[in-house]
Interface confidence: low
């Protein structure tokens, strides 16, 4: 069968696809690009006007087991004098990632994909001021 | 793989590590969280290091749409609304896991893939290198 144009019907499933039981999908957890590294500017969590700390969360029933979460250090932002300016706000920036959750029910084990919201850092924003009449 | 604690009464045939290939339920837990950052907050406009969001779409990946941040300025926005080049807007990058269709076009067969995304920008004091 020829592949129809995208936008009219879907891509046709190739004959070479592995058989998968209904309601499931096959997932290879050998990670592509496993060894790629983040090339962020050095120490930005300390140099930022909205600095943050990192906490490592560990869960042996999750893959990957280690997820790093950021927490903003201040409510306000750090000004040029190194003091906290509470007229501005440090706010978290978040990103979703996928993890595989391993569930034990008695002696049987099942796997579930899960979306996890990770706080990756903080940014300094002008606050939204609500005027009350 | 990683070691998993097991019920001591279970037979020993089960591998304690995550197997290389697993069958997972099609329903993704927490899948209905808001994935469009433009809808979830306006920090990208209100930040002193504002950024634009670019849509990256790949039908061979789940999620098929990922939003990439690009800092608007080299400097940061000061109290007067001008760009201050004594400070730097820098991207905050994060490695995330996505699903890559493998073999290509197969509806229910995937491999985990690690990708690097720029999630937003933050304003930092620059590292100044003094040349002797």
């Amino acid at each position: 069968r020829k592949i129809p144009k995208v936008g009219h019907t879907f891509f046709q499933k190739p004959e070479s696809c592995p058989p998968v039981p209904g309601g499931s999908m096959k997932l290879d957890i050998g990670i592509i690009n496993e060894n790629q590294r983040v090339s962020m500017s050095r120490n930005i969590e300390s140099r930022s006007t909205s600095p943050w700390n990192y906490t490592v969360t560990w869960d042996p029933n999750r893959y990957p087991s280690e997820v790093v979460q950021a927490q903003c250090r201040n409510l306000g932002c750090i000004n040029a004098q190194g003091k906290e300016d509470i007229s501005m706000n440090s706010v978290p920036i978040q990103q979703e990632t996928l993890v595989v959750r391993r569930k034990h029910q008695g002696c049987s084990v099942s796997f579930q994909l899960e979306k996890v919201l990770v706080t990756v850092g903080c940014t300094c924003v002008t606050p939204v001021i609500h005027h009350v009449q | 793989g990683i070691t998993i604690p097991r019920n001591p009464g279970c037979p020993n045939s089960e591998d304690k590590n995550f197997p290389r290939t697993v069958m997972v339920n099609l329903n993704i837990h927490n899948r209905n969280t808001n994935t469009n950052p433009k809808r979830s907050s306006d920090y990208y406009n209100r930040s002193t290091s504002p950024w634009n969001l670019h849509r990256n779409e790949d039908p061979e990946r789940y999620p098929s749409v990922i939003w990439e941040a690009k800092c608007r300025h080299l400097g940061c926005i000061n109290a007067d609304g001008n760009v201050d080049y004594h400070m730097n807007s820098v991207p905050i990058q994060q490695e995330i896991l996505v699903l890559r269709r493998e073999p290509p076009h197969c509806p229910n067969s995937f491999r985990l893939e690690k990708i690097l995304v720029s999630v937003g920008c933050t304003c930092v004091t620059p590292i100044v290198h003094h040349v002797a």
Partner: nanobody, 122 residues
């Protein structure tokens, strides 16, 4: 914009059958699906069918009991539900989406009907 109108819901006894219909009008789409939401639960995927009608997908919980089909001439999709169980009680939504991919993810459906209530009770 696609307009979707569902019909065919109602009260049925356990073991009984119902046939839901979804009439679509507007621009073309790649796939149509049925999703459902039980009281206090997340919306979940039930079944999907490709724009051509060649490919069908089912949730494990309905496989063998429900059949999705479509009439291309009328741009109408159907869900034949047999051997209904109390746990099938939900509001059933018809939705369209672009692409075959991730038919089980309700986030990927763009246009939704208003829903039709199916109650399975004795």
């Amino acid at each position: 914009e696609v307009q979707l109108v569902e019909s065919g819901g109602g009260l049925v006894q356990p073991g009984g059958s119902l046939r839901l219909s979804c009439a679509a009008s507007g621009r073309t789409y790649d796939a149509m699906g049925w999703l459902r939401q039980a009281p206090g639960k997340e919306r979940e995927f039930v079944a999907a069918i490709s724009g051509s009608g060649d490919d069908t997908y089912y949730a494990d919980s309905v496989k063998g009991r429900f059949t999705i089909s479509k009439d291309n001439s009328k741009i109408t999709m159907y869900l034949q539900m047999n051997s209904l169980r109390p746990e099938d009680t939900a509001v059933y939504y018809c939705a369209t989406r672009r692409g075959l991919y991730y038919v089980w993810d309700s986030n990927d459906y763009e246009n939704w009907g208003q829903g039709t209530l199916v109650t399975v009770s004795s």
